[in-house]
């Protein structure tokens, strides 16, 4: 028996959920009330002409991860309002342009993971003027991009192509799309990449390559009139790179002018940093790469790394570098000195210790650095860390959170312009004059602090949540404070007088504390309308801890009897 619409769960707005219900067909009885229909992860094999005929108000149709092998020509003909169509991971071996001819409002189309070899004989997308996100191809059979495949498309926010086994690319195929914000290309073997790349120079803003094996990649010189002025970003995700192919990848960047961001995520470098100097010499300085991001780089032969001097000349213009979770324990002094334009350096989740950081932050290192992030490294001594960083004359922001400092010495040296310091999750249990007096923002949340009695005359923001404080800090220590986040401590109460003493306070977050709901406290918190403007997490996070008969109640809602208040 066919499945009924009653096998779906629909809300009053017409959003119907039929995911993972072992449905073998589209339920019957669907009406114009349905606005969104999710039938993904079922066993549907066939979409018939009449299955969706009455769904004239349907905006989103999700049929991904089924067993669909046939879609009748006019199955979607009544879906004149459809904006989102997902047919991914089915068994469609032939695609038909007639499916889409009535879908002029379609913005999102996902055809990934179906076993077609090509996109068909006629242009599939020529009736989709509003299409903004398109996902096509698969990881095994999709073999050819044809010249007419993208006809009719002028602007795409995102184009994803599963081209792991692409064998043929007709030149200029992608050139028909005038503007592509983001192209995601799954391409195991990059032999066709240069051809494709050339066609994107005038239209693409952001190229993301996934799962590419660059081991034998050779970027043959291509003839172009002028470099791309629109391309802004490259991402290499899960790529395999060798020393030789790294040089070839860098050549890609020669064809781009203007500021550029380059990102390597989850890549493997099967090399020893032995980058060919002669080949690198042919590359113009990477004067246009301003942002370099490397996350989870795997270097099997890390300890065999050669001298990186061959790439120093390419780094002079880089302003922002992130190298995260890549087992970095040392940045060579000579490299630091070559990073003459660097303003922002994020080395989160690495292996930096103070002593090797000293080598990195040597004299004349990173002369313009203003932000340094060393979150979750191997720093142990706050005193040594500050001392080592004194060479960084322009450093204003320092994040050394998630390092195990435990204690704080009485005094420390710091760069003289320090304004922001993040010491959250560092196991510290007391504060001392080690903290720089110049600070404007201090984050010491998630530690073991039970008091705050330190004068910081310029501090504007204090984040001290998840500690063991019993009271609000004394306002006289913090005359400029405008933001105080002190939630999840052990504060019992605070008063109007305390709040008024913070003359510049605009935001207080103090929820999640153990409030004693005394008559005075309730009278103050419930009687001050303006308090809601200051308390950013009011009323939901303010619960009574005592008296016991009101424990767990919201402070805002708690009422004590007259007898309790006039004993």
């Amino acid at each position: 028996a066919p499945h009924q619409a009653s096998s779906l769960s629909c809300d009053p707005a017409g959003v119907c959920d039929g995911r993972s219900r072992s449905l073998s067909s589209i339920p019957s009885g669907l009406t114009a009330a349905v606005k969104s229909l999710d039938l993904s992860n079922n066993r549907i094999a066939y979409v018939g002409s009449s299955d969706l005929r009455k769904c004239v108000n349907l905006r989103a149709l999700r049929l991904g991860a089924n067993s669909i092998h046939t879609v009748e020509e006019d199955s979607f003909s009544s879906l004149g309002s459809l904006e989102h169509l997902d047919l991914s991971y089915n068994h469609l071996s032939n695609l038909s342009s007639s499916w889409f001819k009535s879908l002029s409002t379609l913005k999102f189309l996902n055809l990934l993971g179906n076993p077609y070899k090509t996109l068909g004989e006629t242009p599939l997308f020529s009736h989709l003027p509003n299409l903004r996100i398109l996902k096509i191809g698969n990881n095994d059979t999709f073999a050819e991009i044809q010249a007419k495949d993208f006809q009719g498309l002028t602007f795409l926010q995102e184009l994803e192509i599963g081209a792991s086994h692409l064998q043929r690319y007709a030149p200029k195929s992608l050139r028909s799309i005038q503007n592509i914000s983001h192209l995601i290309l799954h391409m195991r073997r990059p032999a066709l990449l240069p051809k494709i790349f050339v066609d994107l120079l005038s239209s693409l803003e952001y190229l993301e390559l996934r799962n590419t094996d660059f081991s034998t990649f050779n970027f043959s010189d291509v003839s172009i009139n002028e470099p791309s002025t629109v391309m802004k970003k490259f991402t290499f995700r899960k790529a395999e790179i060798t020393d030789a192919s790294f040089t070839e990848i860098v050549k890609l960047l020669n064809y781009v002018s203007g500021a550029l961001e380059v990102e390597f995520d989850d890549c493997t470098l099967n090399g020893r940093g032995d980058f060919s100097t002669s080949a690198l010499d042919t590359i113009k300085s990477l004067g246009n790469v301003e942002t370099l991001t490397v996350r989870r780089l795997h270097i099997p032969q890390f300890f065999l790394f050669y001298d990186l001097r061959s790439i120093y000349s390419l780094t002079g213009a880089v302003k922002r570098i992130t190298i995260e979770n890549s087992k970095v324990f040392l940045v060579p002094c000579s490299l630091s000195q070559h990073l003459k334009s660097l303003e922002y350096l994020d080395l989160s989740e690495n292996l930096m210790s103070e002593e090797y950081l000293k080598n990195s932050a040597c004299e004349h290192a990173w002369p313009f650095l203003h932000t340094l992030i060393l979150r979750q490294n191997h720093l142990k001594s706050l005193e040594k860390t500050g001392e080592v960083l004194v060479t960084l004359k322009n450093l204003t922001n320092l994040d050394i959170s998630k390092n195990n400092f435990d204690s704080m010495p009485e005094t420390c040296q710091w760069p003289e312009k320090m304004k922001y310091l993040n010491l959250s999750s560092t196991r510290i249990h007391s504060l001392t004059h080690c903290l720089p007096q110049t600070l404007e923002v201090l984050d010491i949340s998630n530690n073991n602090l039970n008091s705050f009695s330190l004068s910081l005359p310029q501090l504007k923001e204090l984040y001290i949540s998840r500690n063991k404080l019993k009271t609000l800090p004394d306002a006289s220590f913090l005359p400029m404070l405008s933001v105080l986040r002190i939630s999840r401590n052990t504060i019992n109460t605070f008063s109007k007088e305390q709040l008024d003493s913070f003359q510049k306070l605009k935001t207080l977050e103090a929820g999640g504390n153990n409030f004693i709901c005394s008559c005075d406290f309730l009278s103050f918190t419930q009687g001050q309308q303006a308090l809601a403007q200051v308390l950013s997490d009011w009323p939901e996070n303010y619960l009574c801890d005592s008296p016991s008969h009101v424990r767990g109640q919201r402070v805002q809602d708690t009422r004590l009897s007259l007898t309790e208040c006039h004993r």
Epitope: R296, L304, F329, C333, E349, S353, H378, K402
Partner: antibody
Framework: QVQLVQSGSELKKPGASVKLSCKAS????????INWVRQAPGQGLEWIGW????????NFNENFKDRATITVDTSASTAYMELSSLRSEDTAVYFC???????????WGQGTTVTVSS | DIVLTQSPATLSLSPGERATLSCRAS??????????MQWYQQKPGQPPKLLIF???NVESGVPDRFSGSGSGTDFTLKISRVEAEDVGMYFC?????????FGGGTKVEIK
């Protein structure tokens, strides 16, 4: 405070396998590497290999590559080292040690004595 | 593999004397200006204890009579005034190349 507590002594027959444990406390387990080093009676120290609990990546001394397996249970903050096809030359004290700064072993377990004898 | 040769095999000193322990590597352990050489102390029945890392950095909690020096292939551990509690084996270790290797050790004893 940082502590590495190792499992108790083992007596094994040649050809058998042994699995040693090393329970860590006092630091964020996934942030540091764990190394295994052994010391035969009256001898020097021999590095076996390491694991980084954050991503499970390992590196081994070639002499042990075919016989040693290093694993972690991050939920229990525990590292394990299994050595198979034991021979009498594997009789030694086996230490686990925390790897800091990518290069040095700053905290060591108390050691587990493994005796291989028929 | 990098071979580390320690000398002397045994060092016998009176309390208050200066101890000089040597470690020579078969190839350089230099890594971008930092020598990846460590020194450990091991007392009988105990695990090794880190004294020096990166050739010259003294581990926190280690008495300041211990110091390390050297670069490239030649390294020295000095104990300025030996005390009775300093007896034991001293091992050098390189982490420049895999496999990491240890020296054969120098035994320090008090006369």
């Amino acid at each position: 405070q940082v502590q590495l507590v190792q499992s108790g002594s083992e007596l094994k027959k040649p050809g058998a396998s042994v699995k040693l444990s090393c329970k860590a406390s006092g630091f964020t387990f996934t942030t540091y590497g764990i190394n295994w080093v052994r010391q035969a009676p009256g001898q020097g120290l021999e590095w076996i290999g390491w694991i980084y609990p954050r991503d499970g990546s390992t590196n081994f001394n070639e002499n042990f590559k075919d016989r040693a397996t290093i694993t972690v249970d991050t939920s229990a903050s525990t590292a394990y080292m299994e050595l198979s096809s034991l021979r009498s030359e594997d009789t030694a004290v086996y230490f686990c040690a925390r790897l800091t700064g990518g290069t040095f072993l700053d905290y060591w377990g108390q050691g587990t004595t493994v005796t291989v004898s028929s | 593999d990098i071979v580390l040769t320690q000398s002397p095999a045994t060092l016998s000193l009176s309390p208050g004397e200066r101890a000089t322990l040597s470690c020579r590597a078969s190839e350089s352990v230099e890594y971008y200006g930092t020598s990846l050489m460590q020194w450990y102390q091991q007392k009988p029945g105990q695990p090794p204890k880190l004294l020096i890392f990166g050739a010259s950095n003294v581990e926190s909690g280690v008495p300041d009579r211990f110091s390390g020096s050297g670069s490239g292939t030649d390294f020295t551990l000095k104990i300025s005034r030996v005390e009775a509690e300093d007896v034991g084996m001293y091992f050098c270790q390189q982490s420049r190349k895999l496999p990491w290797t240890f020296g054969g050790g120098t035994k320090v004893e008090i006369k």
